[in-house]
């Protein structure tokens, strides 16, 4: 990737990622420097007849760093702080080629939950107020609520009225997704409204 347009690479928290390096064809490489946010990560001197010299200069990421045979950077056990700008400089006798990358760390979504604050009106209509959440949600998580294939809400919250006298059994499903994972959780309107009805009759007695 040229330095003008960094290659955006997605990594998953806790997993591994490779930043691919392309070599100038037919040129002898003198050394390669890898940088993270403009700080040196590693300095590599290739040898034709023996193993390359690899000097890891960033102790923080050092134990999680590896290099492929073509000196692409492999980073394992990814952490959120690995997010940022990476650059590789390949120096030959005649030129220096720069490759740029932007690494984005995404979380696998975990622990989807639905909370319910519902009301029963005197006409026996049940108004459902549902809120969907996942652990450590960020701005890259999309939420939506669906029923019978229709999207009823594009937010973590759903407000909907359900009348047991005219509506058949109805499931509402929250779907949370990001670029690397998706989770869903379904709730039954009938069950939720029955629970509210029990509470309602208990308080009336």
């Amino acid at each position: 990737q040229s330095s003008l347009t960094p290659l955006m690479v997605n990594g998953i928290l806790g997993e591994s990622v490779t930043l691919p390096l392309e070599f100038p064809a037919g040129e002898k490489v003198n050394f390669i420097t890898w940088l993270f946010n403009e700080t040196s990560l590693a300095f590599i001197v290739p040898h034709e007849t023996k193993s390359p010299e690899i000097h890891v200069t960033n102790p923080k990421q050092g134990k999680r760093l590896n290099f492929t045979q073509s000196y692409s950077l492999q980073l394992s056990n990814l952490k959120m702080e690995d997010t940022g700008s990476y650059r590789a400089q390949i120096s030959t006798k005649t030129s220096a080629k720069l490759s740029s990358y932007t690494l984005r760390i995404l979380r696998q979504l975990r622990n989807i939950q639905v909370t319910n604050h519902s009301q029963l009106f005197q006409n026996m209509t049940c108004e459902l107020h549902l809120t969907c959440s996942v652990e450590d949600a960020d701005d890259n998580v999309s939420f939506r609520w669906e029923a019978l294939g229709n999207t009823l809400s594009s937010q973590p919250n759903l407000t909907v009225s359900w009348d047991p006298r005219i509506s058949s059994e109805q499931d509402y499903t929250c779907i949370a997704e990001n670029a690397v994972s998706n989770l869903s959780f379904s709730v039954s309107a009938q069950k939720l409204c029955e629970d509210v009805k029990i509470q309602y009759t208990d308080t009336k007695m």
Partner: antibody, heavy 118, light 106 residues
Framework: QIQLVQSGSELKKPGASVKVSCKAS????????MNWVRQAPGQDLEWMGW????????RYADDFKGRFVFSLDKSVNTAYLQISSLKAEDTAVYYC???????????WGQGTTVTVSS | QIVLSQSPATLSLSPGERATMSCRAS?????MHWYQQKPGQAPRPWIY???NLASGVPARFSGSGSGTDYTLTISSLEPEDFAVYYC?????????FGGGTKVEIK
Amino acid sequence: QIQLVQSGSELKKPGASVKVSCKASGYTFTNYGMNWVRQAPGQDLEWMGWINTYSGEPRYADDFKGRFVFSLDKSVNTAYLQISSLKAEDTAVYYCARDYGRWYFDVWGQGTTVTVSS
Amino acid sequence: QIVLSQSPATLSLSPGERATMSCRASSSVSHMHWYQQKPGQAPRPWIYATSNLASGVPARFSGSGSGTDYTLTISSLEPEDFAVYYCQQWSSTPRTFGGGTKVEIK
């Protein structure tokens, strides 16, 4: 039917403020996020950010932090975009657009032209 | 942010011809949405989640792709298809649009 109706064109002087409205009808307003999109003359579409119509919490794209404010009046199913300290480069058509999920904008307002000129 | 590059910038074709336009993302995205815009009008939803046609969109339109490469195809151009088509990604904030492909009459 489902629609978003925006307020009319505005001509403003640099440094002034403007408030664009977007009135929703035909659906439960608080169930769908409202996005704002800018299109400068002859330019591409730029996503400005969105507001959660249930909680009222806005989220702004980096280029639109500071002078741009999203707000709601849930009692009249209306979203607002306010721009302060207007500059000539704010001259554009501003669209509101409903998010149907996965940030797919299935319903758009007709657009409000804001012209900033001295 | 994820940059979406659309190509070609302009497609000059005649009615009845096949149109294919590309949208390339600077990073892998899960799905792509497409919108049609005509001069002086708001964009209209056209294709959502890569391959699903929006309500009222004719079957001559199709969408495909995955990862970083997505395509919108019009099998046989009709006069009303001449417009600008924008792709848009949702996988990462900020949501970004491509620069558009203008389909014009040759």
